[in-house]
Amino acid sequence: MKVLQEPTCVSDYMSISTCEWKMNGPTNCSTELRLLYQLVFLLSEAHTCIPENNGGAGCVCHLLMDDVVSADNYTLDLWAGQQLLWKGSFKPSEHVKPRAPGNLTVHTNVSDTLLLTWSNPYPPDNYLYNHLTYAVNIWSENDPADFRIYNVTYLEPSLRIAASTLKSGISYRARVRAWAQCYNTTWSEWSPSTKWHNSYREPFEQ
C-alpha cells in the first residue's frame, strides 16, 4: 500500500481542516488508514482522524482544531496499521479556504431595488470576520447567457442593485462566496442559491 498523491490540506481558519490524498489502488480509507495530527506546541496532544473514502483510491479527513492562529503548525502522520506511509506538516494560516456565507436572502420589497443580504460565516472574535470580501453571482434560469458577477469589496454582507438591471418577469437565482486577501485565501464554496421572480414597473413611455 502506497500513497500516490500526498495529502494536501486546507483550513477554514476556525475549527476544521480538510486533508485529501490518493492511494495507489482502491482503499477502504476508514478501516485501513489513520491520519495522526499534532500541534507543534507545548503540552499539545496527538489526535487521530479517521478518513472517509473520496472516490475509489481517494481519501479525505476532517481534522478538528481549536483556536486556529497564524503561529500554528501541525505535524501529520499517515498510518496504515503499524506502517508509516507519509509524514508531513501543515500550517493552517497558509492554506485557508473560508467557510461559505449563509442565509442568502433577496429582498424585493424596496422600491425597484433588489437588496441581497447574507451572513458572515465567522463569529466576531475570529480574525476573518472583518476581512472577508464577497462575490455575488446572479443568473437567469431561462437564459444561460444572462450570468453576472458582482464583487463586494466592502465589509457589509449585502448588495443593492437596481431591479431594472435585470429582465422583468423572469426568475433569477443568486449565490455568494467569500475570500480574504489578508491570508491570500482561495475562494470559499458557493452558498446555497436562492430564487426570486424579478418584476418591476417599466418607466411609462409616451
Partner: antibody
Framework: QVQLVQSGAEVKKPGASVKVSCKAS????????MHWARQAPGQGLEWMGI????????SYAQKFQGRVTMTRDTSTSTVYMELSSLRSEDTAVYYC?????????WGKGTLVTVSS | QSVLTQPPSVSAAPGQKVTISCSGG????????VSWYQQLPGTAPKLLIY???KRPSGIPDRFSGSKSGTSATLAITGLQTGDEADYYC????????????FGTGTKLTVL
C-alpha cells in the same frame, strides 16, 4: 462573553503555601490553554506556567519548578495555581490568562501578600 | 529568564503619534510572533496586538504593530488621555524549554 473569575486576596506567612483559583466561563473550557503570570508591586509581568485543561498536562517556568503546581477541575471549569514555600518576594498580583501563543483574556488578578 | 527590552517611558501630547520599541534576539522575537498588552492603572493587562500586527475585535485601528528581524514596534496614533498606561510586548523564547516572555514594560504618559 469570556470571563475568568479569580479568588480573593490572600495574606500568608513566609514558608506557607497559597492556592489561587480561576473559574472560566463563556467558552469551551478544555479547548484553550490557561497560563499563569504574576506582577510584583511596581514591576513587570512574569510568566509562571501553563496548563492544558483538556488532559491536565503542565509546563512551568524554570524559576518556579518544584514550588508551583497547576491543576484543573473540568466539572467546574476551574484552574488552580498553588505556590509553596512562600517568601516575601512572592508578594504580587497573580493572574490567570486564557490563550496559546498569546494571552487573549485575563482574570482581574489575585493579590498575594507574604509577610511575617 | 531572558527579557525583552523596552524603553521605560515615552510621552506625547493628545492627538500625536507615539511608538514603543521592543528589542529581543534570534531565540525569541526573531523566531516567533509578537503580541502587545495594555495595562491601565490598577487593572489587568489586555491584549492589544497579536500575531505581530493583528488587532482583536474592539481594538481601534489607532493601534498597530510591526516586526522586523529581532525587534518589534507598537505605534499609537491620535493619542488620547485614556491611552495613558503601561505597555508590554510579549513573545515566545524558543530555547529549551520554550516559554512565553514579556518585555520590561513602557509607561506611556499623555501630556
Amino acid at each position: 462573553q469570556v470571563q475568568l473569575v479569580q479568588s480573593g486576596a490572600e495574606v500568608k506567612k513566609p514558608g506557607a503555601s497559597v492556592k489561587v483559583s480561576c473559574k472560566a466561563s463563556g467558552y469551551a473550557f478544555t479547548s484553550y490553554y490557561m497560563h499563569w503570570a504574576r506582577q510584583a508591586p511596581g514591576q513587570g509581568l512574569e510568566w509562571m506556567g501553563i496548563i492544558n485543561p483538556s488532559g491536565g498536562s503542565t509546563s512551568y517556568a524554570q524559576k518556579f519548578q518544584g514550588r508551583v503546581t497547576m491543576t484543573r477541575d473540568t466539572s467546574t471549569s476551574t484552574v488552580y495555581m498553588e505556590l509553596s514555600s512562600l517568601r516575601s518576594e512572592d508578594t504580587a498580583v497573580y493572574y490567570c490568562a486564557r490563550g496559546k501563543w498569546w494571552l487573549y483574556d485575563w482574570g482581574k488578578g489575585t493579590l498575594v501578600t507574604v509577610s511575617s | 529568564q531572558s527579557v525583552l527590552t523596552q524603553p521605560p517611558s515615552v510621552s506625547a501630547a493628545p492627538g500625536q503619534k507615539v511608538t514603543i520599541s521592543c528589542s529581543g534576539g534570534s531565540s525569541n522575537i526573531g523566531n516567533s510572533y509578537v503580541s502587545w498588552y495594555q495595562q491601565l492603572p490598577g487593572t489587568a493587562p489586555k491584549l492589544l496586538i497579536y500575531d505581530n500586527n493583528k488587532r482583536p475585535s474592539g481594538i481601534p485601528d489607532r493601534f498597530s504593530g510591526s516586526k522586523s528581524g529581532t525587534s518589534a514596534t507598537l505605534a499609537i496614533t491620535g493619542l488620547q488621555t485614556g491611552d495613558e498606561a503601561d505597555y508590554y510586548c510579549g513573545t515566545w523564547d524558543t530555547s529549551s524549554p520554550p516559554q512565553p516572555i514579556f518585555g520590561t514594560g513602557t509607561k506611556l504618559t499623555v501630556l
